[in-house]
Amino acid sequence: CDLPQTHSLGNRRALILLAQMGRISPFSCLKDRHDFGFPQEEFDGNQFQKAQAISVLHEMIQQTFNLFSTKDSSATWEQSLLEKFSTELNQQLNDMEACVIQEVGVEETPLMNVDSILAVKKYFQRITLYLTEKKYSPCAWEVVRAEIMRSFSLSKIFQERLRRKE
């Protein structure tokens, strides 16, 4: 399964779409910056087996998909870009699921790293809480968009490392 290669391309397309989604000048949003505590340590370890690594990436994409599928998100972003972005994420999720199924027979280790997946879930809970507290303001969404772009970029490094391990 060549997930790291295909996922890297999908990740790049998703990043481009995210970059295009900006609606207001981010320069007016500096005071809304927030520390979401990206779980960097979950993307640093080399201890993961391939299926475990994919399951963490899957959770990241799934949570991003959920975040941008809300009605508050639909009210904020340009519809055609949002649809393209959601489609791209959905494709990545499908690729990952197929890849994990392939890996199950190959690896003896557990399929999921529960602690890492929980850390990713909590990270997105913090993002959702921030949006709620900021009443889903345009600047709050800009800050979240920047954060998701950053987390995608950081997970891309993780994917490249995973590809080198193959």
Epitope: S25, P26, C29, L30, K31, R33, H34, E142, A146, E147
Partner: antibody, heavy 121, light 107 residues
Framework: EVQLVQSGAEVKKPGESLKISCKGS????????IGWVRQMPGKGLEWMGI????????AYSPSFQGQVTISADKSISTAYLQWSSLKASDTAMYYC??????????????WGQGTLVTVSS | DIQMTQSPSSLSASVGDRVTITCRAS??????LNWYQQKPGKAPKLLIY???SLQSGVPSRFSGSGSGTDFTLTISSLQPEDFATYYC?????????FGQGTKVEIK
């Protein structure tokens, strides 16, 4: 290694135009904004403006709006500061520095070495 | 624009002294406050960001505190290499603004 390398010192006459550069390397150039800061001889730091190289969106300090133009070419990871008509009062050291944008990360954590601009008749 | 006022504008101190520089913003900037050190002929260097976070590679004798409008940079034990000019800068709202600087000189 993250680096911002600025173009060399310039000596110009009043009324001349000038474009100085700041080339980023060792990081994703479009993931950070680039700010410009002026320091006149013996004086403090003054923020001039900023650019997001990903889309060339800019913002200027009111003191510098209309006096300078900030631009970027992301294909060569370079930001620019330009004047169409220099004045003697533009004599200063100009620094570029990277800014994390809306991300929770240190502001202006890396700086260029500075470009000294001297305007004299 | 948010005005940043540093005090004192200069001070004389000896190696080993505890040095405190203050910075006041004309309106609340939460903790969006940075401190820089600049030596003659060199570019500024980031010391402290978000009011109290120590930048990577900066000695632990430097510390920052404060929130809202009043901020402090402290050097717990001044070293020979610390003689320089220090600037505060707010990153809460554009235009970004710097304090006028505090020059730390040898007594």
């Amino acid at each position: 290694e993250v680096q911002l390398v600025q173009s060399g010192a310039e000596v110009k006459k009043p009324g001349e135009s000038l474009k100085i550069s700041c080339k980023g390397s060792g990081y994703s150039f479009t993931s950070y904004w680039i700010g410009w800061v002026r320091q006149m001889p013996g004086k403090g730091l003054e923020w001039m403006g900023i650019i997001d190289p990903s889309d060339s969106d800019t913002a200027y300090s009111p003191s510098f709006q209309g006096q300078v133009t900030i631009s970027a070419d992301k294909s060569i990871s370079t930001a620019y500061l330009q004047w169409s008509s220099l004045k003697a009062s533009d004599t200063a050291m100009y620094y570029c520095a990277r800014h994390p944008g809306l991300n929770w990360a240190p502001d202006f954590d890396y700086w260029g070495q500075g470009t000294l601009v001297t305007v004299s008749s | 624009d948010i005005q940043m006022t540093q005090s004192p504008s200069s001070l004389s101190a000896s190696v080993g002294d505890r040095v405190t520089i203050t910075c006041r913003a004309s309106q609340s900037i939460d903790d969006f406050l940075n401190w820089y050190q600049q030596k003659p002929g060199k570019a500024p260097k980031l010391l402290i960001y978000f009011a109290s976070s120590l930048q990577s590679g900066v000695p632990s004798r430097f510390s920052g505190s404060g929130s809202g409008t009043d901020f402090t940079l402290t050097i717990s034990s001044l070293q020979p290499e610390d003689f320089a000019t220090y600037y505060c800068q707010q990153s809460h709202t554009l235009p970004l603004t710097f304090g006028q600087g505090t020059k730390v000189e040898i007594k």
